[in-house]
C-alpha cells in the first residue's frame, strides 16, 4: 500500500490521543533504556510503511502484536484516514486470524513495540523543510511542508 495520500495529521491525532497510551500500557514495567531503537524512517509515508510492517507482520519471536489494542486502533486509523487501505488488508486480516488464537508477550515483542514507539515519534515530528533552506533531504511527502 502507498501511504502518500493518507491524512497524516488525523493519524497523528489518533496516535497522540489513544494509540500512544496503549503502547505505554503494553510496555509497562519495561525500562525506556532497555531497548536500543534501530529502525528508522525517512518521511511520513515511509514511517507508516514501517509501522504497518512491525505492527501486523509476524516476525521471528513475536507473532502476536496484531491482536493487541494498539494494533487494532492503528488498523482503524489507517482504514479511516488512508484512502483504499481497508481493501488492501482483507486478505492479510484473514491470514492473521488463521495464524493466531492467543496473545503472548515476549521480550522480542517488547523490543518490537519499543521500535514502534520510535517510528511513531518520527512520524509525528518530522523536521520540516524551511523556505529557502537547501540542506534538507527533499524526499518527503506533499503533506510535509506546512504543519507537524
Amino acid at each position: 500500500y502507498d501511504f502518500t495520500n493518507c491524512d497524516f495529521e488525523k493519524i497523528k491525532a489518533a496516535y497522540l490521543s489513544t494509540i500512544s497510551k496503549d503502547l505505554i500500557t503494553y510496555m509497562s514495567g519495561t525500562k525506556s533504556t532497555e531497548f536500543n531503537n534501530t529502525v528508522s524512517c525517512s518521511n511520513r509515508p515511509h514511517c507508516l510503511t514501517e509501522i504497518q510492517s512491525l505492527t501486523f507482520n509476524p516476525t521471528a519471536g513475536c507473532a502476536s502484536l496484531a491482536k493487541e489494542m494498539f494494533a487494532m486502533k492503528t488498523k482503524a486509523a489507517l482504514a479511516i484516514w488512508c484512502p483504499g487501505y481497508s481493501e488492501t488488508q482483507i486478505n492479510a486480516t484473514q491470514a492473521m486470524k488463521k495464524a493466531r488464537k492467543s496473545k503472548v508477550t515476549t521480550n522480542k515483542c517488547l523490543e518490537q513495540v519499543s521500535q514502534l514507539q520510535g517510528l511513531w515519534r518520527r512520524f509525528n515530528r518530522p523536521l520540516l523543510k524551511q523556505q529557502g533552506s537547501s540542506d534538507y533531504k527533499d524526499d518527503d511527502d506533499k503533506h510535509h511542508h506546512h504543519h507537524h
Partner: antibody
C-alpha cells in the same frame, strides 16, 4: 534517566566561531529530535534549530540559517551546534534539549546550558 | 512565523492566591483537534522545565496546582494557589508550525 551534558563556557572574539557539544546518556539518542535554544542575558528563549540524529536531517530558524550548523554523532550520542561570524549580540546561554517520547513537540530533557561570551 | 504574546510581562501575586498568565498566538496552533501549545517554568540559573504540554496536560512530576487551558489562539496557565517556589519566569511555546517559537516570558513574583 536521560541526561544531556553540555561542554563548558566559551569566550570568543567577534568574527570567530564556537562549537558547543551536548552528550546524551541513559537512553536512546538516534530517534529523538535534538534542538538548540539560546537565551541572551535577561532575555527570553529563542529556538535556533534541530537535528534528527537517525539520518542527520536538520531544520533551522531562518534567522540563523547562514551561521548555524547542527550535527550529530550517533556513535558517541553527541549533538553539536556551531555558530559562526560571532557578534556581541550572540552572547548568551546555549541549551540543547531533547523532544518528548511521543512526538508531542515539547522538550522534556534539557542540558545545563553553555555560556558563550563574545567580546573583543 | 507564529508570534506568541504573553500577558502580563510581570505579575505579583500573594502567597496562596491564584496567578493567571495568558498567551496569544498570531494564528491558530490547533491541528486535527489538538492544540500544540506548551508551557515552561524557568528559575534563575536553570534550564526551563516543562509544566504543561498540549495546552492542558500536566507534565510529569508537576504539582496539580498548575493547570492549562485554551485552544486556537488563546491559552492560559493558572496556578491555583501560589507557593514560594513558584517564583520564576514562565514561557509558552508553540510547535504547530515551524519555526518553533516561544512567548517573551512572564515574570512571576510574590506580592
Amino acid at each position: 534517566e536521560v541526561q544531556l551534558v553540555q561542554s563548558g563556557a566559551e569566550v570568543k572574539k567577534p568574527g570567530s566561531s564556537v562549537k558547543v557539544s551536548c552528550k546524551a546518556s541513559g537512553g536512546t539518542f538516534s530517534t529523538y529530535n535534538m534542538h538548540w535554544v539560546r537565551q541572551a542575558p535577561g532575555q527570553g528563549l529563542e529556538w535556533m534549530g534541530a537535528i534528527y540524529p537517525g539520518n542527520g536531517e536538520t531544520s533551522y530558524n531562518q534567522k540563523f540559517k547562514d551561521r548555524v550548523t547542527i550535527t550529530a554523532d550517533k556513535s558517541t550520542s553527541t549533538a553539536y551546534m556551531e555558530l559562526s561570524s560571532l557578534r556581541s549580540e550572540d552572547t548568551a546561554v546555549y541549551y540543547c534539549a531533547r523532544e518528548d517520547d511521543y512526538g508531542e513537540g515539547y522538550f522534556d530533557v534539557w542540558g545545563q546550558g553553555t555560556t558563550v561570551t563574545v567580546s573583543s | 512565523d507564529i508570534v506568541l504574546t504573553q500577558s502580563p510581562d510581570s505579575l505579583a501575586v500573594s502567597l496562596g492566591e491564584r496567578a493567571t498568565i495568558n498567551c496569544r498566538a498570531s494564528e491558530s496552533v490547533d491541528n486535527s483537534g489538538l492544540s500544540f501549545m506548551h508551557w515552561y517554568q524557568q528559575k534563575p540559573g536553570q534550564p526551563p522545565k516543562l509544566l504543561i504540554y498540549r495546552a492542558s496536560n500536566l507534565g510529569s512530576g508537576v504539582p496539580d496546582r498548575f493547570s492549562g487551558s485554551g485552544s486556537g489562539t488563546d491559552f492560559t496557565l493558572t496556578i491555583s494557589s501560589l507557593q514560594a517556589e513558584d517564583v520564576a519566569v514562565y514561557y509558552c511555546q508553540q510547535i504547530n508550525t515551524d519555526p518553533l517559537t516561544f512567548g517573551q516570558g512572564t515574570k512571576l513574583e510574590i506580592k
